[in-house]
């Protein structure tokens, strides 16, 4: 025999108190799949969190962080204060990247500069606390009589898709 609750779509719940008819989720709750016997309480984006996407009857709210803070963890489970580019957040606050490392964002950790020599290339532009090194042509390509080289394409900021 088919479970009558399986006919209840997302956004409703199978109400045992009302002969297993499908009732809409109450305000501030949702069900993202059919056949649910209860609706889940919507996440509330409060304090240092702000609402990125409102809760609907079929999907939970999504949070990000208020100005000066950024998300950490799956689904933005925490917010932490921004640091400057060229820094990383430690237990003692924001600290400058050590020599040989960089961070080009207000969040995350300092990462080592690219080792150009591993790819057989030379350093075209030195790295800084905020920027990675730029690798150029291999030293052999720079020897007298070598053909001219095409300058490297400008680096894209991470996290941005091409226009």
């Amino acid at each position: 025999l088919q479970d009558p609750c399986s006919n209840c779509p997302a956004g409703t719940f199978c109400d045992n108190n009302r002969n297993q008819i499908c009732s809409p989720c109450p305000p501030n709750s949702f069900s993202s799949a059919g056949g649910q016997r209860t609706c889940d309480i919507c996440r509330q984006c409060k304090g240092v969190f702000r609402t990125r996407k409102e809760c609907s009857s079929t999907s939970n709210a999504e949070c990000d962080c208020t100005p000066g803070f950024h998300c950490l963890g799956a689904g933005c489970s925490m917010c932490e204060q921004d640091c400057k580019q060229g820094q990383e957040l430690t237990k003692k606050g924001c600290k400058d990247c050590c020599f040989g490392t960089f961070n080009d964002q207000k969040r995350g950790i300092c990462r080592p500069w690219t080792n150009c020599s591993l790819d057989g290339k030379s350093v075209l532009v030195n790295g800084t606390k905020e920027r990675d090194v730029v690798c150029g042509p291999s030293p052999a390509d720079l020897s007298p009589g070598a053909s001219s080289v095409t300058p490297p394409a400008p680096a894209r900021e991470p996290g941005h898709s091409p226009q």
């Epitope: 409060k46 100005p67 921004d82 400057k84 957040l89 606050g93």
Partner: antibody
Framework: QVQLQESGPGLVKPSETLSITCTVS????????VHWVRQPPGKGLEWLGV???????DYNPSLKSRVTISKDNSKNQVSFKLSSLTAADTAIYYC????????????WGQGTLVTVSS | DIQMTQSPSSLSASVGDRVTITCRAS??????VAWYQQKPGKAPKALIY???YRDSGVPSRFSGSGSGTDFTLTISSLQPEDFATYYC?????????FGGGTKVEIK
């Protein structure tokens, strides 16, 4: 206990640059941000900008080209500078701490009155 | 910029009265609203953040509510020390903006 104290010049001339220092105690600038807010006599509050624990700054676009906020963690001091002053910049200037729970101001300094006049 | 419009701009009330101040945002700010109290010659004092969370040490007669664009600060039973000006502030996006203030005076 948490305290913030502003110290300013009181009177400055038009076109000059205003410099105010906020000295804090009871908390560390390594962990907390500090906002600057002003209030013209008899009027409401205007947010000017903030310096975060890591030293990054955000300014009100209406004043961005004129405002600079910096800090010295070891001296427990935050510095506020406003250039190209006019009489419209006459106000009480407050510094205030940002808590770790929201982008708001939980503790305020007593404020310093700055009058712009020749 | 997000405009925060407070009403009324001033009100007269008696000790023991229930007082309600409203604040309307020009666009959705979720629950990212704070309320401050300012007495003459003094710095503002934080009362409420996140629309409804009382700051530590704030008496329970102060309560906040609302989300989206409409927010309310309620003083359930006005005390002599509550006569002051009250400001709302949104912190959903930069620049942070304040309402114009509501002055609560003695009737």
């Amino acid at each position: 206990q948490v305290q913030l104290q502003e110290s300013g010049p009181g009177l400055v001339k038009p076109s000059e640059t205003l410099s105010i220092t906020c000295t804090v105690s009871g908390f560390s600038l390594i962990s907390y941000g500090v906002h600057w807010v002003r209030q013209p006599p008899g009027k409401g509050l205007e947010w000017l900008g903030v310096i975060w624990s890591g030293g990054s700054t955000d300014y009100n676009p209406s004043l961005k080209s004129r405002v600079t906020i910096s800090k010295d963690n070891s001296k427990n001091q935050v510095s506020f500078k406003l250039s190209s002053l006019t009489a419209a910049d006459t106000a009480i200037y407050y510094c205030a701490r940002n808590p770790l729970t929201a982008t708001v101001m939980d503790y305020w300094g007593q404020g310093t009155l700055v009058t712009v006049s020749s | 910029d997000i405009q925060m419009t407070q009403s009324p701009s001033s009100l007269s009330a008696s000790v023991g009265d229930r007082v309600t101040i409203t604040c309307r945002a020009s666009q959705n700010v979720g629950t990212n609203v704070a309320w401050y109290q300012q007495k003459p010659g003094k710095a503002p004092k934080a009362l409420i953040y996140s629309a409804s969370y009382r700051d530590s040490g704030v008496p329970s007669r102060f309560s906040g509510s609302g989300s989206g664009t409409d927010f309310t600060l309620t003083i359930s039973s006005l005390q002599p020390e509550d006569f002051a000006t009250y400001y709302c502030q949104q912190y959903n996006s930069y620049p942070l903006t304040f309402g114009g203030g509501t002055k609560v005076e003695i009737k």
